[in-house]
């Protein structure tokens, strides 16, 4: 519609009490340069006066020549394309609608931007890939819908409460499209990380805790096995009995099949967690292991070298 002023800015901005809000904004007036600008809080049109009522947070004809360090609300724009705003500090009662009342020589426009200010710092959000497999590098993302030039923050990664050694890459966006702070951590999880708690902690510039988000790692991995043999030294005489037991210490997802291998070859009809060898013969000497599979793949135990000696 050619009869409209054109604005670009994030639809909603988020902050918390005492922080600040930086509102990237561009515009194009319908005709010529802007003559005046008023920033309203929760503006309401008054039909009787044909004007907007509401708290005036900034008035170009007044605040434009007040030293900027004295102003909580600053218009950082100009009279033809930039309508960027800053509120520092921002307060809980600033929540609501900001109304940008723009007037050129012959045209007027009211542009609305939503501001959501919480009482306390809101938590970031951890994003994980849909599936995490052991030893495969993944990127953990921590996203916070906040960034402001006057209020530096940091995002720190913790694993079971301990800072993670891997280097994280933090990026910020303060554009008309989006305002956020993001931290990305490349990480190769081991099976032992399954079930562990990862935390993304929001801190102020001094490292003071503000808020956090936590997730429990779901690391897909092949079954992890332990093999036990009786006798424990796996040295027997012909005619003796040997018992081998396979224990699953971890499997994600659950295991589906069990088998035993001798010298890399599957032993037929041995599909339980216990392998009983009775009255062993010399040719039963060799390397034994158990193999347990799940949807990720097969897991093998360490090999046990069974030595059958002459009686």
């Amino acid at each position: 519609d050619s009869s409209k002023w054109v604005f670009e800015h994030p639809e909603t901005l988020y902050a918390w009490e005492g922080a600040c809000v930086w509102i990237p904004c561009t515009y194009r007036a319908l005709d010529g340069d802007l003559e005046s600008f008023i920033l309203f809080h929760n503006p309401e049109y008054n039909k009787n006066t044909s004007k907007f009522d509401g708290t005036r947070l900034y008035e170009s004809t007044k605040d434009g020549k007040v030293p900027s360090e004295q102003k909580r609300v600053q218009f950082l724009g100009d009279k033809n394309k930039n309508c960027t705003l800053s509120i520092h500090p921002v307060h809980l009662n600033d929540s609501g609608q900001l109304g940008l009342r723009m007037e050129s020589k012959t045209e007027k426009w009211m542009e609305r931007i939503h501001l959501n200010v919480s009482e306390r710092p809101f938590p970031p959000h951890i994003q994980l890939p849909p599936e995490i497999q052991e030893s495969q590098e993944v990127t953990l993302t921590c996203l916070l819908n906040f960034s402001c030039y006057g209020y530096p923050i940091q995002l720190q990664w913790l694993l079971e409460g301990v800072p993670m050694r891997q280097a994280a890459v933090t990026s910020t966006s303060l554009t008309i499209k989006s305002v956020f702070t993001r931290s990305e951590l490349k990480f190769s999880p081991q099976w032992s990380h399954h079930g562990k708690i990862v935390t993304c902690q929001l801190q102020d510039a001094d490292g003071k805790f503000l808020s956090n988000d936590t997730v429990q790692l779901n690391v897909k991995h092949t079954p992890k096995l332990e093999i036990k043999v009786t006798p424990s030294d796996a040295i027997v005489r012909e005619g003796d009995s040997v018992t081998m037991t396979c224990e699953v210490s971890s499997s994600n997802p659950e295991y589906t099949t069990v088998s035993w291998l001798k010298d890399g070859t599957s032993l037929k009809k041995q599909n339980t967690f216990t392998l009983n060898l009775r009255e062993v013969t010399k040719d039963q000497s060799g390397k034994y292991c158990c193999q347990v599979s799940n949807d990720v793949g097969p897991g093998r135990s360490e090999e046990v070298f069974l030595q059958v000696q002459y009686a």
């Epitope: 802007l34 005046s36 170009s60 004809t61 007044k62 434009g64 020549k65 030293p67 100009d78 009279k79």
Partner: antibody, heavy 120, light 112 residues
Framework: EVQLVESGGGLVQPGGSLRLSCAAS????????MNWVRQAPGKGLEWVGR????????NYSGKFKGRFTISADTSKNTAYLQMNSLRAEDTAVYYC?????????????WGQGTLVTVSS | DIQMTQSPSSLSASVGDRVTITCRSS???????????LEWYQQKPGKAPKLLIY???NRFSGVPSRFSGSGSGTDFTLTISSLQPEDFATYYC?????????FGQGTKVEIK
């Protein structure tokens, strides 16, 4: 047409008080800073202070704080300069001048001035 | 307070002459928003001042092109490229960047 008309000047004794008026017309009075500037006979210009009629915010030159008070009545589109404890050195022509731009800031419109003479 | 010092205090010139008036501030007059609110005003006897130049170098509407302003930081200049009969007056620089706002003491341009 934007116009500023000062009034209220005259002869006053040392220690006395005087209130000057600046009647504005031709623009939205509440939304421009109004300044007071004075000029002693044969001397240069001196900024006294300013007011934003929309909310009554003021700034003063330190020299005049306490003795001079600037106010405004938006219903009458008039700014005032209340001068107390006047001295001989306050003898001057007093001008009101509008800060006329949202962006560039300058005194674009001046009143014709009103003479204040402090003498016994 | 910021002192604005103009030189010369007075000068004599003829019609057609190029005239330069300088104004020096006792400290930088860059406003916290990055602008420099340095203005030049012309005043004739018995009249109110008139704006010539704002923000160092911008000519106010209706001001003839022979008037120009330049400078930065603490040193500023008003130039009249070719003096006309109606230009004989007193000229004041003014800083509106920091409180209290201050004027220079004035430069009187007289007919030689």
């Amino acid at each position: 047409e934007v116009q500023l008309v000062e009034s209220g000047g005259g002869l006053v004794q040392p220690g006395g008080s005087l209130r000057l008026s600046c009647a504005a017309s031709g623009y939205e009075f509440s939304r421009s800073w109004m300044n007071w500037v004075r000029q002693a006979p044969g001397k240069g210009l001196e900024w006294v202070g300013r007011i934003y009629p929309g909310d009554g915010d003021t700034n003063y030159s330190g020299k005049f704080k306490g003795r001079f008070t600037i106010s405004a009545d938006t219903s009458k589109n008039t700014a005032y300069l209340q001068m107390n404890s006047l001295r001989a050195e306050d003898t001057a022509v007093y001008y009101c001048a509008r800060d006329g731009s949202s962006w560039d800031w300058y005194f674009d419109v001046w009143g014709q001035g009103t003479l204040v003479t402090v003498s016994s | 307070d910021i002192q604005m010092t103009q030189s010369p205090s007075s000068l004599s010139a003829s019609v057609g002459d190029r005239v330069t008036i300088t104004c020096r501030s006792s400290q930088s007059i860059v406003h916290s928003d990055g602008n420099t609110f340095l203005e030049w005003y012309q005043q004739k006897p018995g009249k109110a001042p008139k704006l010539l130049i704002y923000k160092v170098s911008n000519r106010f509407s209706g001001v003839p092109s022979r008037f120009s302003g330049s400078g930065s930081g603490t040193d500023f200049t008003l130039t009249i490229s070719s003096l006309q009969p109606e230009d004989f007056a007193t000229y004041y620089c003014f800083q509106g960047s920091q409180f209290p706002y201050t004027f220079g003491q004035g430069t009187k341009v007289e007919i030689k």
